[in-house]
């Protein structure tokens, strides 16, 4: 059997660190057997069998010129093996970032904080943390560790499915290379890393007969589980074309009627989502949707579907944002959003 322990990595390759002493091991001999060492393709003897170092070659203060292939020969001239030296560095702790687009699953991505120059792999696992004692603020790793399954195709990402929203988790990402291992531990709670995907299906429509009104509607992101316990609230922004500043409102549900649009101008509208109890952060903005208020006279009947602001239709004021709306509202599927008075009655 070979006297050379096989480091993790491709066979026949041995590893060292620049500026450090490196020992190369002749793989095809018995431990301690004297050998001669040569650089591949060069006749010059690097180290003879009388060095007293047996089957090892010592390179003091290795540098990049020492990288390459070495040949070791036994006393009778037989080939003891070939060894390729690759220089690099031990791993540093990777940088880890975790995010959740819903309240049941989260994913973690990582990246090396320093390039080692050596073959590298990552071990990923997690524990669920629990509070010690009823009155104690201390937390300790309790259950696990479980593997955090990595994405196929080598993407630097792993996913924890079926996470508990109120629990804390300790993520372990260990960077491993032939010179060692280094671990980053990251404590995460779903509440703090929750960032929903942006709302979907944003539509902007004119309100016939109302030259300063636009109706925007949207749906929950598809990634958000359909359960009534964890709701989303929304933030809507709109602005006329060529106008730099956004006006912002917090709609009560899945639609909003803008009452201070600029007549005749197309308007950009976008919407963002957040957990309704302010866990985590706001989603990114949805792609913008565009709409232009209708032209024409005001109809005698107010459309039943709109939560219309009751401002009169006066001359357009580009910088008059709509007043903010209540942000904490029940799940859209649980209530009819036709009338805010009706909503209050249901809530009461």
């Amino acid at each position: 059997s070979s006297p050379c322990p096989q480091a993790w990595g491709p066979p026949g390759v041995q590893y060292g660190q620049p500026g450090r002493s490196v020992k190369l091991c002749c793989p095809g001999v018995t431990a301690g057997d004297p050998v001669s060492w040569f650089r591949d393709g060069e006749p010059k003897l690097l180290q003879g069998p009388d060095s007293g170092l047996g089957h090892e070659l010592v390179l003091a203060q290795a540098d990049s010129t020492d990288e390459g292939t070495y040949i070791c020969q036994t006393l009778d001239g037989a080939l003891g093996g070939t060894v390729t030296l690759q220089l690099g560095y031990p791993p540093a702790r990777p940088v880890v970032s975790c995010q959740a687009a819903d309240y049941e699953n989260f994913s973690c991505t990582w990246s090396p904080s320093q390039i080692s120059g050596l073959p590298t792999r990552y071990l990923t696992s997690y524990r669920k943390k629990t509070v010690l004692g009823a009155d104690s603020q201390r937390r300790s790793p309790s259950t696990g560790p479980w593997p955090c399954p990595q994405d196929p195709l080598g993407a630097a990402r792993c996913v924890v499915h079926g996470a508990e929203f109120w629990s804390q988790y300790r993520i372990n990402v260990t960077e491993v290379n032939p010179l060692g291992a280094s671990t980053r531990l990251l404590d995460v709670s779903l509440q703090s890393i929750l960032r929903p995907d942006p709302p979907q299906g944003l539509r902007v429509e004119s309100v016939p007969g109302y030259p300063r009104r636009l109706r925007a509607s949207w749906t929950y992101p598809a990634s958000w589980p359909c359960q009534p316990h964890f709701l989303l609230k929304f933030r809507l922004q709109y602005r006329p074309a060529q106008h730099p500043a956004w006006s912002t409102v917090e709609p009560a549900g899945l639609e909003e009627v803008i009452t201070d649009a600029v007549a005749g101008l197309p308007h950009a509208v976008r919407v963002s989502a957040r957990d309704f109890l302010d866990a985590g952060t706001w989603s990114t903005w949805s792609p913008e949707a565009w709409g232009t208020p209708s032209t024409g006279t005001i109809p005698k009947e107010i459309p039943a579907w709109g939560q219309l602001h009751t401002q009169p239709e006066v001359e357009p004021q580009v910088d008059s944002p709509a007043p903010p709306r209540p942000s904490l509202q029940p799940h859209p599927r649980l209530l009819d959003h036709r009338d805010s008075v009706e909503q209050v009655a249901v809530l009461a």
């Epitope: 540093a92 702790r93 940088v95 320093q114 390039i115 120059g117």
Partner: antibody, heavy 118, light 107 residues
Framework: EVQLLESGGGLVQPGGSLRLSCAAS????????MTWVRQAPGKGLEWVSS????????QYADSVKGRFTISRDNSKNTLYLQMNSLRAEDTAVYYC???????????WGRGTLVTVSS | DIQMTQSPSSLSASVGDRVTITCQAS??????LNWYQQKPGKAPKLLIY???NLQTGVPSRFSGSGSGTDFTFTISSLQPEDIATYYC?????????FGPGTKVDIK
């Protein structure tokens, strides 16, 4: 010679923008994370932002999140800090630093002064 | 974020004196603690890394110890060129934080 050289500082009005650069030389820039640290006049050191070698992960101090963006161009051996919506409290000397193991700053630039004032 | 506190905030000592600065972290940071020296108008300089390791080229009169939450930085024999502000800094977290600094001058 191993060194970092910052540039791009100056006087800017509140709400304005500035882009800092840090030119690295003497080491393999693309192998290392890079960091911005700032120091307000007469005050202590404050970590601002860091970026990993490949540029795919970044971290920011809460005080600058959403306003500052760190980036790098490994082909130019240059680190950047785009600073938007600047406030008076952003007035500081901004240092570029090379960390080992993400947070051990073994090489620093001389710094560039950013003054936010009307 | 992990908070770092340092004491004293300033001190005066004579040349040759032993000077000790302490640093405390708001939570366990293992040994991920560094010490820096900053002279007026200059960039900081790393002296000690990971609690007790002397950075290459730094004089051996500087030393550090501790782990967990409590750390100590020592100058065994203060020299005139050691007049500076000294900062501790944790990097256990991915958001590094510095202590407020200790200003050292000569009596």
């Amino acid at each position: 010679e191993v060194q970092l050289l910052e540039s791009g500082g100056g006087l800017v009005q509140p709400g304005g923008s500035l882009r800092l650069s840090c030119a690295a030389s003497g080491f393999t820039f693309s192998w290392y994370s890079m960091t911005w640290v700032r120091q307000a006049p007469g005050k202590g050191l404050e970590w601002v932002s860091s970026i990993v070698p490949y540029g795919d992960l970044t971290q920011y101090a809460d005080s600058v999140k959403g306003r500052f963006t760190i980036s790098r161009d490994n082909s130019k051996n240059t680190l950047y800090l785009q600073m938007n919506s600047l406030r008076a409290e952003d007035t500081a000397v901004y240092y570029c630093a090379k960390p080992e193991d993400w947070g051990r700053f073994d090489l620093w630039g001389r710094g560039t002064l950013v003054t936010v004032s009307s | 974020d992990i908070q770092m506190t340092q004491s004293p905030s300033s001190l005066s000592a004579s040349v040759g004196d032993r000077v000790t600065i302490t640093c405390q972290a708001s939570q366990d940071i293992n040994n991920y603690l560094n010490w820096y020296q900053q002279k007026p108008g200059k960039a900081p300089k790393l002296l000690i890394y990971d609690a007790s390791n002397l950075q290459t080229g730094v004089p051996s009169r500087f030393s550090g110890s501790g782990s967990g939450t409590d750390f100590t930085f020592t100058i065994s024999s203060l020299q005139p060129e050691d007049i500076a502000t000294y900062y501790c800094q944790q990097h256990e977290s991915q958001s590094p934080t510095f202590g407020p600094g200790t200003k050292v001058d000569i009596k």
